[in-house]
């Protein structure tokens, strides 16, 4: 079974632009079955944005969401 914060989708590439932190609603990791590790941020418009889990900006955005949502990972 998937963990509560593991998504069912895969990513081909990482988004290279600025992450719109204030417009993010949740995040999750892609499945281990995927060929590329990624963190997916979901925006208020429902867009899934693939991001590099090693990127400092990505880690910062995850921390922001964890604080915003009282620390818990969001269900995918």
């Amino acid at each position: 079974a998937r963990g509560t914060n593991v998504g069912r989708e895969c990513c081909l590439e990482y988004f290279k632009g600025a992450i719109p932190i204030s417009r993010l609603t949740r995040w999750y990791k892609t499945s281990g079955e995927c060929p590329k590790d990624a963190i997916v941020f979901v925006t208020v418009q429902g867009k899934s944005i693939c991001s590099d889990p090693k990127d400092k900006r990505v880690k910062k955005a995850v921390r922001y969401l964890q604080r915003t949502w009282k620390g818990g990972p969001q269900e995918s």
Epitope: R8, E9, L12, Y14, A38, K47, S48, I49, C50
Partner: antibody, heavy 124, light 107 residues
Framework: QVQLQQSGPEVVRPGVSVKISCKGS????????MHWVKQSHAKSPEWIGV????????IYKQKFKDKATMTVDKSSSTAYMELARLTSEDSAIYYC?????????????????WGAGTTVTVSS | DIVLTQSPATLSVTPGDSVSLSCRAS??????LHWYQQKSHESPRLLIK???QSISGIPSRFSGSGSGTDFTLSINSVETEDFGMYFC?????????FGAGTKLELK
């Protein structure tokens, strides 16, 4: 207008390989991923996989991992798929189809533009 | 893999009829469901994305609804050019999968 132009039909012997092509035009080729879809006679489409037109990163459906190899040539805006060790089960129409940008997750993978299809017939 | 079950397999209608085509997913796929039309000897054509979002150039008689596991493509007043196969496709879970299709034919 946006078009995907595929290579012509192939009739090949069992056991050999075939490489089919898909040339994108009317849009920025590297802005969209390219998918490949198999459709056997009178059957529903079956997704083979998707390739990033930027990096060449690819995701394959498990059953096609040893059958299909997807590549891209950015300079000619062309995607390729090679099918190896062909058998009669591989006889089908193969479509390329344009997907959403690479950096969206797979929940955004639908196909808004399709090629006309390449018919591959495997016959001895 | 997520299985999409389409029903009915064949639908016989007269031009002017309004019809509903069903697509049922083996597990919840949110709204990540898309519809295609395929006429004989042609490539599939995208009709509806994300359950209900319209596509530029597609006639307004085509509409979609549903969520979770049950989805419907509706055609309001079928025209002769609408006959062919209709497929649903899910993008919620990798690998992407298609339904077996519904054939819309002339009664």
């Amino acid at each position: 207008q946006v078009q995907l132009q595929q290579s012509g039909p192939e009739v090949v012997r069992p056991g050999v390989s075939v490489k089919i092509s898909c040339k994108g035009s009317g849009y920025t080729f590297t802005d969209y991923a390219m998918h490949w879809v198999k459709q056997s006679h009178a059957k529903s489409p079956e997704w083979i996989g998707v390739i990033s037109t930027n990096s060449g990163n690819a995701i394959y459906k498990q059953k096609f991992k040893d059958k299909a190899t997807m590549t891209v040539d950015k300079s000619s805006s062309t995607a390729y798929m090679e099918l190896a060790r062909l058998t009669s089960e591989d006889s089908a129409i193969y479509y390329c189809a344009r997907g959403r940008p690479d950096y969206y997750g797979s929940s955004h993978w639908y196909f808004d533009v399709w090629g006309a299809g390449t018919t591959v017939t495997v016959s001895s | 893999d997520i299985v999409l079950t389409q029903s009915p397999a064949t639908l016989s209608v007269t031009p002017g009829d309004s019809v509903s085509l069903s697509c049922r997913a083996s597990q919840s796929i949110s709204n990540n469901l898309h519809w295609y039309q395929q006429k004989s000897h042609e490539s599939p054509r995208l009709l509806i994305k994300y359950t209900s979002q319209s596509i530029s150039g597609i006639p307004s008689r085509f509409s979609g609804s549903g969520s979770g596991t049950d989805f419907t493509l509706s055609i309001n007043s079928v025209e002769t050019e609408d006959f062919g196969m209709y497929f649903c496709q899910q993008s919620d879970s990798w690998p992407l999968t298609f339904g077996a299709g519904t054939k819309l034919e002339l009664k």
